[in-house]
């Protein structure tokens, strides 16, 4: 499924994740929009053989598991083909892990290079949540 | 079959303590966040503590706050209620039960599979 | 006191349709029902408002919207006589609804 930007704004707000850790609803938007396009069903091979799954593109080595990444942690504790649903459950919960863990949503190279110190409210703006 | 099963409820005098355990198979309990609800004779459904996947985000309802403590213990497939500080109106039958979404961190959508209960009965 | 608001008792008559309301600002996320008959635990019949878990009847509906979650039955049934509970996402609960099939 590809999202629309107000559609995203308000499942992952009804799912939580607005000012989750402190971010601000625009952030996530912001971060799904660099890293999957509003795709849920993205996913990008890595060169160290791990792959991103998903709307946050959530990484396979230390996030889920998908069965062929070496040493993987599945640290969220799900099959990564959980993180392709239409459904964005997996993807929130996963990414509240993964906020939580001390690098906050630096952990997204997408979130750090395209949304960090920017206007990310205007992801929101006009939505009606 | 997914099965919950609680024991250790009994009669207990105010202010003393009581541990319960609930016993999960059929599933991967490491996975799922685990709840205990309660049943006042009578009454309606009082939630009363959520232990995620994650062993650190346990929450609390406030009646319970600072007296009771939820733990599990995933190699066991064990959930367990600490009830310390018992008072006349923690009287109940009390459930356990799983949450419907596999991994859910923080954040409770229902909950899919329940036990029979336990009864809990605090009189001097 | 609840945070989540129901009506005590809704009735019906056979093979029409129940609706019980549940309100409250935690309902700006998800909310679910349960249904409990006396003697038995409760049974989840929609969670993430509107989804339904294997083996519930597809009678068995739920909505959102503006803070407010409803459950739908169609073709209420004598076995749909019960108490309704809605639940939030915090974990709590409403005060229940009984339902009663004339």
């Known amino acids: 499924k590809v999202f629309g930007r107000c559609e995203l704004a308000a499942a992952m707000k009804r799912h939580g994740l607005d000012n989750y850790r402190g971010y601000s609803l625009g952030n996530w938007v912001c971060a799904a929009k660099f890293e999957s396009n509003f795709n849920t069903q993205a996913t990008n091979r890595n060169t160290d053989g791990s792959t991103d799954y998903g709307i946050l593109q959530i990484n396979s080595r230390w996030w889920c598991n998908d069965g062929r990444t070496p040493g993987s942690r599945n640290l969220c504790n799900i099959p990564c083909s959980a993180l392709l649903s239409s459904d964005i459950t997996a993807s929130v919960n996963c990414a509240k892990k993964i906020v939580s863990d001390g690098n906050g949503m630096n952990a997204w190279v997408a979130w750090r290079n395209r949304c960090k110190g920017t206007d990310v409210q205007a992801w929101i703006r006009g939505c009606r949540l | 079959e997914f099965q919950l099963v609680e024991t250790g409820g009994g009669v207990v005098q105010p202010g003393r303590s009581l541990r319960l355990s609930c016993a999960a198979s059929?599933?991967?309990?490491?996975?799922?966040?685990m709840h205990w609800v309660r049943q006042a004779p009578g009454k309606g459904l009082e939630w009363v503590a959520v232990i995620y996947y994650d062993e650190n985000n346990k929450y609390y309802a406030d009646s319970v706050k600072g007296r009771f403590t939820i733990s599990r213990d995933n190699s066991k497939n064990t959930l367990s209620l600490q009830m310390n500080s018992l008072r006349a109106d923690d009287t109940a039958v009390y459930y356990c039960?799983?949450?419907?979404?596999?991994?859910?961190?923080?954040?409770?959508?229902?909950?899919?599979?329940w036990g029979q209960g336990t009864t809990v009965t605090v009189s001097a | 006191s609840y945070d989540l608001t129901q009506p005590p008792s809704v009735s019906v008559s056979p093979g029409q349709t129940a609706n019980i309301t549940c309100s409250g600002n935690?309902?700006?996320?998800?909310g679910c029902w349960y249904q409990q008959k006396p003697g038995q635990s409760p049974l989840l019949v929609i969670y993430q408002d509107n989804k339904r878990p294997s083996g519930i009847p597809e009678r068995f509906s739920g909505s959102n919207s503006e803070n407010t979650a409803t459950l739908t039955i169609s073709g209420t049934q004598a076995l749909d006589e019960a108490d309704y509970y809605c639940?939030?996402?915090?974990?709590?609960f409403g005060g229940g609804t009984k339902l009663t099939v004339l």
């Open positions: 639940q939030a996402w915090d974990g709590s």
């Open positions: 039960a799983r949450d419907v979404v596999v991994a859910a961190f923080d954040f409770s959508y229902g909950m899919d599979v």
């Open positions: 059929g599933f991967i309990f490491s996975s799922y966040g």
């Open positions: 935690k309902l700006e996320k998800f």
